[in-house]
């Protein structure tokens, strides 16, 4: 079951697995969810009683029954992790910890004006974990308003120590925060020659990349196939590092394939959770249990719903033995891989999905797109809503996108002449106006976030935000749609969509089905010469036919330019202005969500 | 073992410009400051500046600023200080001294290795 | 700027007797202090830092004290390698300061 609240006072006996240092109770409850088999955890607090070198420790603990017994300690502070628990879990943590030490390897000092400058350059380096900045009242002068950079092997610090006038903090990676480039491909027949920090078994590639992206010292990976040579080799997962953060040497070997950890895209791309199925596949391990399973489906889902078991292995049942029930093996290992992958053997193996809780929900696929045709189908795109204004009759306004359970991304031009939020409603999960009756259920809005450097649409910051009154609950029909990766500020997208409900030519009135329009991006550089009386600048983004013929139009304000990339859709633009609809050598204008992300991140997660 | 070695006494003319090295060994040359004091004959000594070689930012007494710069080489472990348009009072002796480790948190320290210093003449 | 002023300007003492060279500060320096010695022809050497710490390798003849505004460095029997000037330098705020200097010669 699923306990959040922590338990003051409190030791948990015995069942230790390791020890690390938190700076607080909470970070260390984000620890032990991250950890492949800690559930239950005891953090020692700083405390007059206690043992100042016992302070800040984080003990990660496992137990067969998911519970030991409890000791009653003055600043002990125990609880469960989230491993047990439904809702999405993130390691973001922008906390400061004040008078704080966090001890790592100092590996980079500068001068920084404050700690959220010092965090940003934490944040940049793809080394650092952690840092500590020394304020303007630290009592040695030369260390006023240095930056110290730190790692670790665990990414959490060695020891946590009191000093005064310094403040301490984490990078904010994990909060998808990071300007460091994200590259998302993996090189074939590749050997990255590099000092190995870890080695795990792994089936394919691409989980050797996603293990290597939530290893906190890996920067890139080999991996070895199952027809590798070397025997002893195959199926192993060398996670790397470098003191420049990119491989020294790369060797062409068959067989090997490499890349790079997914950390500046994490928020974009599923890193935790391995959903495939690996067929004629064993996975080893410490054996759970064993129970009888109609299918390597129904395997998962019990391997999924016992908190313990982090991967299994599927023996499909022979002829008509046990009512056509296989069996299935539950599994788990130190680090939450299999010792060893065999094959040829008839098994079908797989990882629990509990970790997927982990991973951004916008990174789910969906349906799969329905080719040609102009108006959509129910699913298609779960991210679009409509908003309606209710005054001075009730009509819809503008379009939206999902990027929260309680958010929604927009164009701020929308809300012109829009006094109160009281006057909106957002429906989600509609694909025809004509559904939308009486009693359709909606969100109401509690507030408008606009761009509080937004004049008109042309002159640029075209965006707001929607916080919802309630939270969106997440299904095939609706669901949110991710934010492009800072560090994907390269990326060229070919896999562009405009969808809404609005005009289909400029003298029109609101389609009832929702429409969608493939478009291709146009540079700014072109789209300039297409708008010599307006400056387009780096914080829009235009798309449209030479032609013409296709784009947005009067009603699909607001809405989502959504492009697929590496089977992940990402809102990469906000329908903005432009002159007339689909004419000729007029692309449309769309916000440049990217440029944007920022913003997004400080207003949608403000305390 | 630690040392700063510096280059080799010079003769100036009023206006002239002097720039003075100290090459650093023994220790990682990035992770400690470096001050430049110097001392004018039968004088006490007088802070010039300081300057940080892992980002080269640096600071100077208000004394000479403009007139002086610090700057660093990291390939040869080297700090540089170029003192321009020189008169006769800025005959002396110019040391560097190394200063703060800046890879730790402490609250005190001082300069505990120096240069063997630099005489500059300055004359018509 | 803070002014580091230093007394007496020359010390005479026997060897073997004790020596108490004054530091004062025009504001409060807290423990930012350094002391170090400087013989004739030759560069300065560190002795005491953070007004009390003695630095690597010196004896434990030398000893300092005080902090805020008013220091002292005490050198508990003068060997004949101690005859020398020695500076106070405050390291609490920028420009760095040293004091005029204590001769101490022998008596």
């Known amino acids: 079951e699923c306990v959040t609240q922590l338990l003051k006072d409190t030791c948990f006996e015995g069942g230790d697995i390791t020890t690390v240092f938190t700076p607080s109770a909470k970070y260390c409850q984000v620890v032990c969810t991250y950890h492949p088999r800690c559930l239950l955890f005891t953090f020692t607090a700083e405390s007059p009683s206690e043992d100042p070198t016992r302070w800040f420790t984080c003990v990660l603990k496992d137990s067969v029954t998911e519970t030991l017994p409890r000791v009653n300690r003055t600043a002990a502070i125990s609880g469960y992790s989230f491993k047990q628990c439904s809702h999405q879990i993130s390691a973001c943590n922008k906390d400061i910890y004040v008078d704080l030490d966090m001890k790592g390897i100092n590996y980079n000092s500068s001068v920084a004006k404050s700690a959220q400058e010092c965090q940003e350059r934490c944040t940049d380096d793809v080394h650092c974990h952690f840092f500590t900045y020394a304020t303007r009242q630290f009592p040695s002068l030369e260390h006023r308003n240095i930056c110290l950079l730190k790692h670790t092997q665990t990414g959490t610090p060695t020891r946590i120590t009191k000093l005064d006038k310094v403040v301490s903090g984490f990078s904010l990676k994990s909060c998808a925060l990071s300007n460091l480039a994200c590259i998302r491909d993996i090189f074939p027949n590749t050997v990255f020659a590099d000092s190995n920090i870890d080695s795990v078994m792994a089936p394919d590639a691409f989980v050797c990349g996603r293990i290597c992206t939530h290893h906190p010292g890996c920067l890139f990976f080999t991996f070895f196939s199952q027809e590798w040579p070397k025997e002893s080799q195959r199926n192993l997962c060398l996670l790397k590092t470098s003191e420049s953060g990119l491989p020294s040497t790369r060797i062409k070997k068959s067989k090997a394939l490499s890349g790079f950890s997914l950390q500046s895209c994490r928020h974009s791309i599923p890193v935790f959770c391995h959903s495939s199925f690996y067929h004629d596949t064993d996975f080893l391990g410490e054996e759970l249990d064993i129970v009888a399973a109609k299918s390597h489906e129904a395997c998962q889902k019990l391997c999924t719903n016992a908190v313990r078991c982090q991967f299994f292995t599927y023996t499909p049942a022979q002829a008509s033995c046990n009512e056509g029930k296989g069996k299935c093996y539950l599994k788990l290992s130190s680090n939450g891989s299999p010792t060893k992958i065999l094959h040829g053997r008839g098994g079908i193996s797989g990882y629990t999905l509990r970790l997927c809780k982990m991973d951004n929900e916008c990174t789910t696929k969906i349906k799969p797109r329905i080719v040609g045709g102009t108006a959509s189908v129910r699913g298609e795109w779960p991210w679009q809503v409509t908003l309606h204004t209710t005054s001075p009759t009730q009509r819809h306004l503008c379009g939206g996108s999902i990027i929260g359970n309680q958010w929604i991304l927009t164009a701020a031009h929308c809300f012109y002449g829009v006094e109160s939020p009281k006057i909106l409603r957002v429906y989600s999960g509609i694909l025809n106006q004509s559904e939308i009756k009486e009693d359709t259920s909606f969100f109401g809005v509690q507030e408008i976030i606009i761009h509080d450097q937004y004049k008109m649409a042309e002159s640029g910051y075209d965006i707001a935000l929607l916080k919802l009154e309630t939270t969106v609950n997440y299904t095939d029909s609706q669901r949110p749609i991710c934010l492009p990766s800072k560090g994907d500020r390269n990326v060229i997208y070919t896999d562009c969509w405009v969808t809404g409900w609005g005009y289909r030519k400029l003298r029109d009135k609101i389609q009832n089905t929702l429409q969608k329009a493939k478009i291709p991006l146009v540079t700014n550089e072109e789209c300039q010469k297409r708008y010599r009386g307006h400056k387009i600048t780096h914080k829009m983004i235009c798309a449209g036919y030479r032609e013409g013929g296709k784009d947005a139009c009067k009603g699909d304000s607001g809405g989502p330019l959504s492009c697929k990339h590496n089977e992940v859709w990402h809102l990469v633009g906000i329908t903005s202005w432009g002159e007339g609809c689909a004419q000729r050598e007029r692309p449309g204008v769309y916000t440049n969500v990217v440029e944007y992300v920022d913003w997004i991140l400080e207003k949608t997660q403000a305390v | 073992q630690v040392q700063l070695v510096q280059s080799g006494a010079e003769v100036k003319k009023p206006g002239a410009s002097v720039k003075v090295s100290c090459k650093a060994s023994g220790y990682t040359f990035t992770s400690y400051s470096m001050h430049w004091v110097r001392q004018a004959p039968g004088q006490g000594l007088e802070w010039m500046g300081i300057i940080n070689p892992s980002g080269g930012s640096t600071s100077y007494a208000q004394k000479f600023q403009g007139r002086v710069t610090m700057t660093r080489d990291t390939s040869t472990s080297t700090v540089y200080m170029e003192l321009s348009s020189l008169r006769s009072e800025d005959t002396a002796v110019y040391y560097c001294?190394?200063?703060?480790?800046?890879?730790?948190?402490?609250?005190?320290?001082?300069?505990?290795?120096w240069g063997q210093g630099t005489t500059v003449t300055v004359s018509s | 700027e803070i002014v580091m002023t230093q007394s007496p300007a020359t010390l005479s003492v026997s060897p073997g007797e004790r020596a108490t060279l004054s530091c004062r500060a025009s504001q409060s320096v807290s423990s930012n202090l350094a002391w170090y010695q400087q013989k004739p022809g030759q560069a300065p050497r560190l002795l005491i830092y953070g007004a009390s710490t003695r630095a690597t390798g010196i004896p434990a003849r030398f000893s300092g004290s005080g902090s805020g505004t008013e220091f002292t460095l005490t050198i508990s029997s003068l060997q004949s390698e101690d005859f020398a000037v020695y500076y106070c330098q405050q390291f609490n705020d920028w420009p760095l300061t040293f004091g005029g200097g204590t001769k101490v010669e022998i008596k």
């Open positions: 001294a190394r200063g703060a480790y800046l890879l730790e948190l402490y609250y005190y320290y001082g300069m505990d290795v």
